[in-house]
């Protein structure tokens, strides 16, 4: 059985944003390599990242097949240069990940304000509908396609000359808000899935202000 000492992976952690999903773990390998397997609760195990010296593995291609499924991964440790030299008749060391349900747990990426348009005392603010790596009929779905009405956006807006913020919400990607004529406003948006218990909110988008390039103004 040799005298090579392998150690099991630990601190297995899912890092996922807008369904781009990477499994990370420790330790940095010394004289060992790793292979990852992923499975749904009821499905078969699929191997990824064969005999790698990395401590991360991109599992996006697997989880986007069904983002509402619950996944489990495990990381195997093998002696470098001799992956047959493991434990009892080749049984390797391995560690199981926490369970991961992409639809419920993937972080919402920072949204972007695509445009805003002022028509008199109303401003239409449009949030960019970010493309994900989830496919349907060979096309990539947007965040709205995947989450539907589960996803809302909160708009924070305020006069450039003051700090008092107002909020608006939408379950589309557009806001129509009332503004004071002649005033410049600044905007920031946040993606929210109210039904979630974890990772409910994204970080705020970069602030966009009227009088800058993104806006379009039409005085009526």
């Amino acid at each position: 059985s040799g005298t090579t000492n392998t150690v099991a992976a630990y601190n297995l952690t899912w890092k996922s944003t807008n369904f781009k999903t990477i499994l990370e773990w420790e330790p940095k390998p010394v004289n060992q390599v790793y292979t990852v397997q992923i499975s749904t609760k009821s499905g078969d195990w699929k191997s990824k990242c064969f005999y790698t010296t990395d401590t991360e593995c991109d599992l996006t291609d697997e989880i986007v097949k069904d983002v509402k499924q619950t996944y489990l991964a495990r990381v195997f440790s093998y002696p470098a240069g001799n992956v047959e030299s493991t434990g009892s008749a080749g049984e390797p060391l391995y560690e199981n990940s926490p369970e991961f349900t992409p639809y419920l747990e993937t972080n919402l990426g920072q949204p972007t304000i695509q445009s805003f348009e002022q028509v008199g005392t109303k401003v239409n603010v449009t949030v960019e509908d970010e493309r994900t790596l989830v496919r349907r009929n060979n096309t990539f779905l947007s965040l709205r396609d995947v989450f539907g009405k589960d996803l809302i956006y909160t708009l924070y807006y305020w006069k450039s000359s003051s700090s008092g913020k107002k909020t608006a919400k939408t379950n589309t990607n557009e806001f129509l808000i009332d503004v004071d004529k002649g005033e410049n406003y600044c905007f920031s948006v946040q993606a929210v899935i109210p039904s979630r218990t974890v990772n409910r909110k994204s970080t705020d988008s970069p602030v966009e202000c009227m009088g800058q390039e993104k806006g379009e103004f039409r005085e009526i």
Epitope: S1, G2, T3, T4, N5, T6, V7, A8, Y10, W45, L72, R74, G87, S88, A89, G90, E91, L93, Y94, E95, N96
Partner: antibody
Framework: QVQLVESGGGVVQPGRSLRLSCVAS????????MHWVRQAPGKGLEWVAL????????NYADSVKGRFTISRDKSKNTLYLQMNSLRAEDTAVYYC????????????WGQGTTVTVSS | EIVLTQSPGTLSLSPGERATLSCRAS???????LAWYQQKPGQAPRLLIY???SRATGIPDRFSGSGSGTDFTLTISRLEPEDFAVYYC????????FGGGTKVEIK
């Protein structure tokens, strides 16, 4: 809490069969390597069989190879040992035990079930 | 098959004394694959040490393991009344095998 409970032991005649069961609670048998270990009266521990985490690979002690079969049922979270062509020397307390993936050792054991092979 | 030979067969000691148990392998064993168990009459074995020197969860620090290659040792620094039992070493190499056991009895 994490627990294993064996059943199915009893008195059986030589040449007959018996199936032992081991029900797990607090963890999933299909995520870990699972073993059967036996102990003849007044003797030491003897490893019997192993089913890997993958449920496909199986290993057996030479003394039981071809007669015993280890298996598991994911839906019942249960480990089995099918024992055929039993012999007097198979008389023992049979324990099921778990090997977690992270190290080479059996960290959870059942209380044991007694098999007596006698005519 | 790797054969594990434990010595002594029986160790007679008093509470508070130090116990040193030996396990010798017929060929080199990776320390990752060496474990120690305690068994009391009528009970299942209990994992004490894995990886030759790592204590299992809930095991008091008076138990320690050491060794490499073919020679491994379990040490109980100060025997408590509940430590009197049979101790087995086990290797997880090409096939899993146990040593014959060492009985630690009250002198």
């Amino acid at each position: 809490q994490v627990q294993l409970v064996e059943s199915g032991g009893g008195v059986v005649q030589p040449g007959r069969s018996l199936r032992l069961s081991c029900v797990a609670s607090g963890f999933t048998v299909s995520n870990d390597g699972m073993h059967w270990v036996r102990q003849a009266p007044g003797k030491g521990l003897e490893w019997v069989a192993l089913i890997w985490y993958d449920g496909v690979n199986k290993n057996y002690a030479d003394s039981v190879k071809g007669r015993f079969t280890i298996s598991r049922d994911k839906s019942k979270n249960t480990l089995y040992l099918q024992m055929n062509s039993l012999r007097a020397e198979d008389t023992a307390v049979y324990y099921c035990a778990r090997r977690p993936g992270t190290f080479y050792g059996l960290d959870v054991w059942g209380q044991g079930t007694t098999v007596t092979v006698s005519s | 098959e790797i054969v594990l030979t434990q010595s002594p067969g029986t160790l007679s000691l008093s509470p508070g004394e130090r116990a040193t148990l030996s396990c010798r392998a017929s060929q080199s064993v990776s320390s990752s694959y060496l474990a120690w168990y305690q068994q009391k009459p009528g009970q299942a074995p209990r994992l004490l040490i894995y990886g030759a020197s790592s204590r299992a969860t809930g095991i008091p620090d008076r138990f320690s393991g050491s060794g490499s290659g073919t020679d491994f040792t379990l040490t109980i620094s100060r025997l408590e009344p509940e430590d009197f039992a049979v101790y087995y070493c086990q290797q997880y190499g090409s096939s899993l095998t146990f040593g014959g056991g060492t009985k630690v009895e009250i002198k």
